[in-house]
């Protein structure tokens, strides 16, 4: 019996379409596939950023695959051909690996890249990114921000920079249509007549960096002699009520501080008849049902009650 062998795929390469980290891995069928004409050949592809401990593995019947990578580091990938037993009348056969790598040749020393990059998606409406210039760069250094997400034909440059001392230190983004729940890629590169500037690459999803507005219309309602219901309304904007978590801080007679996290726009507080003053503030955050992470809003304006007895009427700020 002659051992059945199959070649690895040909022309395996990683192609950068200019999407700031979203790369194409592509290949051609192996040589001498004529013996397996009735076969559906599959390919096992493994890839990772250089330095990562784990490979990502996929099996596909296609001749291409796309995924996002961190272009601050190199990328390595390997692929081999798989033949299920139905192709070989007996046993699974796999080829040797074809391997390839990709990296962007770095310009400039690492210290020249932007520092403390920070992006916030305010109220799920307005994206703002800010950064500090690299360490030791001269005032003639300027930074440019480019971004891409699936749905854009090509990477776009920021058109509304935030400046300080003539340098770009941030970007106000335009309305970003259909941009959440997908990877958002950013590159900040720079230029200087003095020395080359290192580029920086960032990837995140917009729903995970949302900072909502604080809740509004804080009110008190007496529920019983020893219970007070605190209520508030969701902030104006596109974020639905189901997406909010809230944190409340309640101060009773300037002594007791109660903090609580709740999912609804109400909180029932046990009080004593001796309560003379009650104040509370609320802040909001996008919850786990709508994002993997988020940023707490600022605290709301404080709502206070002072007097002999909490009225049965609603107290509205």
């Amino acid at each position: 019996d002659t051992e059945i062998k199959v070649n690895p795929p040909q022309d395996f390469e990683i192609v950068d379409p200019g999407y700031l980290g979203y790369l194409y891995l592509q290949w051609q069928p192996p040589l001498s596939l004529d013996h397996f004409k009735e076969c559906t050949v599959e390919y096992e592809l493994k890839y990772r950023n250089i330095g990562s401990e784990t490979w990502k593995t996929i099996i596909t019947k296609n001749l291409h695959y796309k995924d996002g990578f961190d272009l601050n580091k190199g990328i390595e990938a390997k692929i081999h051909t798989l033949l299920p037993w139905q192709c070989t009348n007996g046993s699974e056969v796999q080829s040797s690996w074809a391997e390839t790598t990709y990296w962007i040749s770095p310009q400039g020393i690492p210290e020249t890249k932007v520092q403390d990059m920070d992006c916030v998606y305010y109220n799920w409406q307005y994206l703002l990114c800010s950064w500090k210039p690299g360490i030791g760069v001269l005032l003639d250094t300027n930074y440019n921000l480019f971004y891409w997400y699936e749905g854009l034909d090509h990477a776009l440059q920021c058109v509304d920079y935030i400046k300080a001392d003539g340098q770009n230190i941030g970007c106000r983004f335009p309305y970003l249509e259909a941009s959440d729940y997908k990877d958002f890629y950013i590159c900040v590169n720079g230029s200087s007549e003095n020395k080359p500037i290192r580029s920086s690459y960032f990837t995140f999803q917009l729903q995970n960096i949302v900072k909502p507005l604080p809740p509004v219309y804080l009110t008190f309602t007496r529920e019983s002699s020893c219970e007070i219901k605190l209520k508030w309304s969701i902030p104006l904007g596109p974020i639905p009520a189901r997406c909010f978590d809230y944190e409340i801080e309640i101060r009773e007679d300037d002594t007791t501080l109660v903090t609580a996290t709740v999912e609804n726009e109400t909180y029932t507080l046990k009080t004593t008849n001796e309560t003379r003053q009650l104040c509370f503030v609320v802040r909001s955050k996008v919850n786990i049902y709508c994002s993997d992470d988020g940023i707490w809003s600022e605290w709301s304006d404080k709502q206070c009650w002072e007097g002999e007895d909490l009225s049965k009427k609603t107290l509205l700020r």
Epitope: T40, T57, I59, N62, P84, W85, E92
Partner: antibody
Framework: EVQLLESGGGLVQPGGSLRLSCAAS????????MSWVRQAPGKGLEWVSA????????YYADSVKGRFTISRDNSKNTLYLQMNSLRAEDTAVYYC??????WGAGAFDYWGQGTLVTVSS | DIQMTQSPSTLSASVGDRVTITCRAS??????LAWYQQKPGKAPKLLIY???SLESGVPSRFSGSGSGTEFTLTISSLQPDDFATYYC??????????FGQGTKVEIK
């Protein structure tokens, strides 16, 4: 006649472990890739894991990676799913399924009757 | 990951009706698609593989078509035994293997 018979389901506390088995008969077990697919109560089908015919290649859904391990014993015609660090969201009927054609997964032409795993305190 | 979206979620029909269920993939999956039927408390049953190939023993009133991103399952004349939930599944690229959310065919 192809038959797949799951066992090993039951009630387990969050953080606990279970090992599911699937006894196969009626086909050359070692030649076919196999998978586990689960269905939470009142929900749709969710693929969990796959293994090639030889057992040399294994694949997992992100939701179970690092917690579940698929394996097979071709001498016993049995497929296994070791489930550790179980969570409430792992509660489901678990089916083993035979792959009609392919290295690790494909169309599933035969399914077991399923075994119920309930994760609750 | 490749997302599979079925429509409609629920379909009310009568015996003898021609029924069509649609499955859309978030990217091209060539013809690597299967259709399953599932009845309450039972395991799924393979009806169609490779988008249009009828599994052995499945009645010829079931047929599948489509390629790329758009696929359909057609039941030419609905029978009493056909009231069930139907799922599509892609196996072009994995992990993960992904299923549609299901279409329940109920009696009108």
């Amino acid at each position: 006649e192809v038959q797949l018979l799951e066992s090993g389901g039951g009630l387990v506390q969050p953080g606990g472990s279970l090992r599911l088995s699937c006894a196969a008969s009626g086909f050359t077990f070692s030649s076919y890739a196999m998978s586990w697919v689960r269905q939470a109560p009142g929900k749709g089908l969710e693929w969990v894991s796959a293994i090639s015919g030889s057992g040399g290649s294994t694949y997992y859904a992100d939701s179970v990676k690092g917690r579940f391990t698929i394996s097979r014993d071709n001498s016993k015609n049995t497929l296994y799913l070791q489930m550790n660090s179980l969570r409430a969201e792992d509660t489901a009927v678990y089916y083993c399924a035979k792959v009609r054609y392919g290295w690790g997964a494909g169309a599933f032409d035969y399914w077991g009757q399923g075994t119920l795993v309930t994760v609750s305190s | 990951d490749i997302q599979m979206t079925q429509s409609p979620s629920t379909l009310s029909a009568s015996v003898g009706d021609r029924v069509t269920i649609t499955c859309r993939a978030s990217q091209s999956i060539s013809s690597w698609l299967a259709w399953y039927q599932q009845k309450p408390g039972k395991a799924p049953k393979l009806l169609i593989y490779d988008a249009s190939s009828l599994e052995s023993g499945v009645p010829s009133r079931f047929s599948g078509s489509g390629s790329g991103t758009e696929f359909t399952l057609t039941i030419s004349s609905l029978q009493p035994d056909d009231f069930a939930t139907y799922y599509c599944q892609q196996y072009d690229t994995y992990p993960p293997i992904t299923f549609g959310q299901g279409t329940k065919v109920e009696i009108k």
